[in-house]
């Protein structure tokens, strides 16, 4: 058979051959960082000629070209500089907002050597919509400018850029956009392993219901996770074995898959693993229907026995057939277990597709994905039951559009990636799920099902009792620390008689803990401004209690996520370099932010935290309170910027005994504490018969109700000082 000519050098770069100079061999070019090869690859045809995939004209000289990042096509309500057609590696673009708009995202972004911008999409938002302004990523064009419930926005990419993420997003009832943020990227761009590992790991961990790879305490290392979610996980590993994958690359695919299997079996969950290799046809090496699929050693040995030569007779890339074999496996399992049974319906399915190129036979893989979604009944309610991760390796002939089409679209998560080479893939799987660091103190998880008890819905919620009577509330922020209000402690330093009542699945009355130490903010002094006619002042109204023993985590006792920590960062599914300011911008991102606190009877009540100009008008009514503040000239003397304000319109007001309790928000089905209940102008419980009776203030009440909550974003130095060894704080 003729061999292909050897005059294929690339100036400034190197090349590798999958099968020497023989027909069927794939030649892959590579360039130093910051440059990309054009063309990326050539295929040796049976005629003995090189062919460039996708090329229409005759063979051109291969060159290394400089990588560039896409320019903004449009930037709303602000300006960006400098204005270039595209940006060189290392080049910056800066964003500023017009008056009345707040910048969310990164004010300055740098073009990275992989053709991707660092940071996050900059958005100038005024918080007016039901959903935050979804922004326009660099290189994209958006149609749709209304952000109300049910409104849709559509995206496309300019010129030859490729869209990854969702081309259409809808503003949902919970104030969050459906799908995942669209990004426009150069066709030659790829992902760095250090970006992929946390993104993939976070998404995967979220699916497992266990996300806290950040505990510092030594005893948590090596401890296994008790996953709180019921049910079973089916993991399907699909390994591309087509002609363009060299034998060495296939070995790394296998090794990466083994790493994944090893990690996944370290979780205390019921898991079955399927192994499928594919080229022109799929070969099922392990089926989830086989009992051995639950046994780690059996799964790994079937992976080790996967042979590169199994597919030498059919060397195309039939991704459709590979995914269809997953569909057939699901279909058989459904028939076996019964379509209507919980045993079938409670199985979560994760598909990891490792490929090096586009499918070139067997029809559209999207069709197989549609069949899979259909058989699993994937809809908004059951979205959590399927995750498809499409990972392209070797940027040669990987089709971004196809990968993006196959990967799941979930808010704040990424499921489609392209890595430069198999070494990068290995790195990703090595760092993706470092089980040794995972613990079961996952934060901010509450049971949202209709039949859950109040304590299961807010398992961080605790009651503080000085003697026999309850006096204040608080929130577990770790397995041994409670955050509450300083004004609850007015008896000097003797807390020996105090008790903290924590939720306990074994008792409806909870479990009582003694306090090892109380750390009360030294800045708190209710009489600090008495001389100014301010009879009560609640600045620095914050305290921490260290419990005498650790709380055993359960459905009834679990910490809430504190913003500005790595634990919260994982729960928000934000990138690794996020800061405290990013958390504030994400959580308190509107003029009126819906939030909650827990009532004396344990139920969750609704409030709206007023921000920006609305904060000012919310706080202003304090000037009408003549008893507590007889000669107040400046409201800010009483309501400093340490406070969040609520109590307008239909808001519930907290009672005195609800002081110290968490003021929290829900994001991505997780809960984040942004404040703690401090003081107010109206007590709806005063003189009531019991914990279930609350009286709404009459509309004519002067002053009208207002409630003030310590803003945790303003207490960061103090929190860091005392919790630095307990939580992992992000940079401010």
């Amino acid at each position: 058979a003729p061999s292909c000519p050897q005059n294929v050098n690339i100036s400034g770069g190197t090349f590798t051959l999958s099968h020497g100079w023989a027909p069927g061999s794939l030649l892959t070019y590579s360039c130093p960082q910051g440059l990309y090869p054009s063309p990326a690859s050539r295929l040796c045809k049976s005629s003995g000629q090189w062919q460039t995939p996708g090329a229409t004209r005759s063979l051109s000289k291969a060159v290394c070209k400089p990588v560039r990042c896409p320019a903004p096509v449009s930037f709303e309500n602000g300006i960006y500089t400098p204005r270039l057609g595209s940006y060189p590696v290392g080049g910056n673009v800066s964003f500023e907002c017009e008056d009345g708009f707040i910048l969310r995202g990164s004010p300055v972004r740098q073009c990275r050597p992989n053709g991707m911008w660092d940071g996050e999409t900059a958005v100038c938002d005024n918080g007016a919509g039901h959903c935050p302004n979804p922004g326009i990523s660099l290189g994209a064009v958006r149609t749709g400018f209304r952000f109300g419930h049910g409104d849709k926005v559509r995206y496309r990419c300019s010129s030859n850029l490729v869209l990854t993420g969702s081309s259409e997003r809808e503003c949902q009832g919970n104030g969050v956009w459906s799908g995942t943020e669209p990004i426009c990227r150069q066709p030659y761009s790829y992902d760095f392993p250090e970006d992929v590992a946390p993104a993939l790991g976070t998404s995967f961990s979220h699916m497992l219901g266990a996300t806290n790879p950040t505990q510092k305490t030594k005893e948590s290392l090596g401890r296994k996770i008790q996953i709180q979610r019921s049910g079973h996980l089916n993991l399907y590993l699909l390994l591309d074995c087509s002609q363009s994958v060299s034998e060495n690359d296939f070995l790394i695919f296998k090794e990466s898959a083994s790493l994944m299997v090893d990690r996944i079996f370290s979780f205390e969950i019921n898991v079955s693993v399927a192994i499928i290799t594919f080229a022109s046809e799929p070969k099922v090496l392990m089926s989830v229907l086989n009992d051995n699929s639950r046994d780690m050693t059996e799964v790994i040995s079937s992976l080790e026995n996967a042979n590169y030569k199994d597919h030498e007779n059919g060397t195309g890339t039939n991704t459709y057939a590979a995914l269809n074999s997953v569909y057939l496996m699901m279909n058989n399992q459904m028939r076996l277990l019964g379509m209507e049974t919980m045993a079938w319906q409670e199985i979560r399915h994760a598909i990891i597709l490792l490929t090096d190129g586009k499918s070139n036979m067997g029809g559209s893989p999207k069709t197989a994905v549609d069949h899979i979604r259909e058989i699993l009944n994937i809809n908004q309610k059951r979205n959590d039951y399927l995750d498809i991760y499409a990972i392209g390796v070797g940027k040669l002939d990987v089709d971004w559009r196809e990968l993006n089409e196959l990967g799941s679209k979930k808010d704040g998560e990424r499921h489609a990636f392209i890595l430069q080479d198999t070494k990068a893939l290995h790195q990703v799987f090595e760092h993706m799920l470092d089980v040794s660091k995972l613990t079961d103190t996952i934060c901010g998880v509450g049971n949202m099902s209709a039949n859950a008890s109040d304590q299961e819905r807010t398992p961080w919620h605790v009651t503080i009792k000085p003697k026999s009577q309850e006096t204040c509330r608080g929130a577990l922020i770790s397995d041994q620390w409670v955050l509450t209000a300083a004004h609850c402690f007015r008896d000097g330093n003797d807390h020996s008689l105090w008790r903290v009542n924590v939720g306990d699945p074994k008792s409806q009355w909870g479990k009582e803990f003694l306090i090892e130490k109380a750390v009360i903010s030294p800045g708190f002094d209710v009489f600090a401004k008495k001389n100014q006619g301010i009879l009560e002042f609640y600045g620095d109204d914050i305290a921490l209690l260290k419990l005498a023993q650790k709380v055993k985590m359960s459905t009834h006792a679990r910490p809430i996520c504190l913003p500005c920590t790595m634990e919260a960062n994982l729960a928000l599914r934000r990138p690794q370099g996020s800061t405290c300011r990013d958390h504030e911008n994400e959580l308190l991102n509107k003029q009126s932010v819906p939030a909650h606190f827990v009532a004396l009877n344990g139920s969750k009540l609704n409030i709206n935290l007023k921000m920006g100009v609305e904060w000012t008008s919310c706080a202003e009514v304090v000037s009408q309170e003549k008893t507590m503040f007889p000669n107040l000239t400046d409201v800010r003397e009483v309501v400093t910027d340490q406070f969040l304000c609520s109590g307008t319109q239909e808001d519930e007001s907290p009672c005195k005994g609800e002081s110290g309790g968490a003021v929290f928000l829900e994001r991505r089905f997780r809960f984040f504490q942004v404040g703690l209940v401090s003081w107010g102008l109206y007590n709806p419980c005063l003189g009531s018969a019991d914990k279930n009776s609350r009286k709404r203030a009459p509309r004519s009440k002067v002053p009208p109700p207002r409630d003030f909550h310590i803003n945790l974003f303003r207490m960061q130095p103090w929190l860091r000082q005392h919790l630095g060894d307990v939580l992992n704080f992000l940079p401010l």
């Epitope: 003697k467 309850e470 007015r490 008896d491 004396l600 019991d690």
Partner: nanobody, 122 residues
Framework: QVQLVESGGGLVQPGGSLRLSCAAS????????MGWFRQAPGKEREFVSS????????EYADSVKGRFTISRDNSKNTVYLQMNSLRAEDTAVYYC???????????????WGQGTLVTVSS
């Protein structure tokens, strides 16, 4: 727990005034919200007034607002209720109560006085 003893009740004509006192024993008096409740014959016990542990904020039932004034003297461990412009419907046994949280939930209060009778009649 705080022990409470009320005094100052009696018979008074409509439009008249009375000052009720409530003496508390226990060194933690200054940490407690203090309040007054009343119970008319055949009726439920109802909230009248309360004062915060700091003395800085006070609350009144709508029916007594502008006529009654609550105050406290932490040095004497005593809380007072000054009642002016008394009406026949103010006739009741007046009880003093102490509450650490300040909500004065009837189901949770465990510090009550024995009560002092106020009769408003001509």
């Amino acid at each position: 727990q705080v022990q409470l003893v009320e005094s100052g009740g009696g018979l008074v004509q409509p439009g008249g005034s009375l000052r009720l006192s409530c003496a508390a024993s226990g060194h933690t008096f200054r940490s407690y919200y203090m309040g007054w409740f009343r119970q008319a014959p055949g009726k439920e016990r109802e909230f009248v007034s309360s004062i915060s542990w700091t003395g800085g904020s006070t609350e009144y039932a709508d029916s007594v607002k502008g006529r009654f004034t609550i105050s406290r003297d932490n040095s004497k461990n005593t809380v007072y209720l000054q009642m002016n412009s008394l009406r026949a419907e103010d006739t009741a046994v007046y009880y003093c109560a102490a509450d650490y949280s300040g909500d004065f939930l009837l189901s949770d209060l465990d510090s009550w006085g024995q009560g002092t009778l106020v009769t408003v009649s001509s």
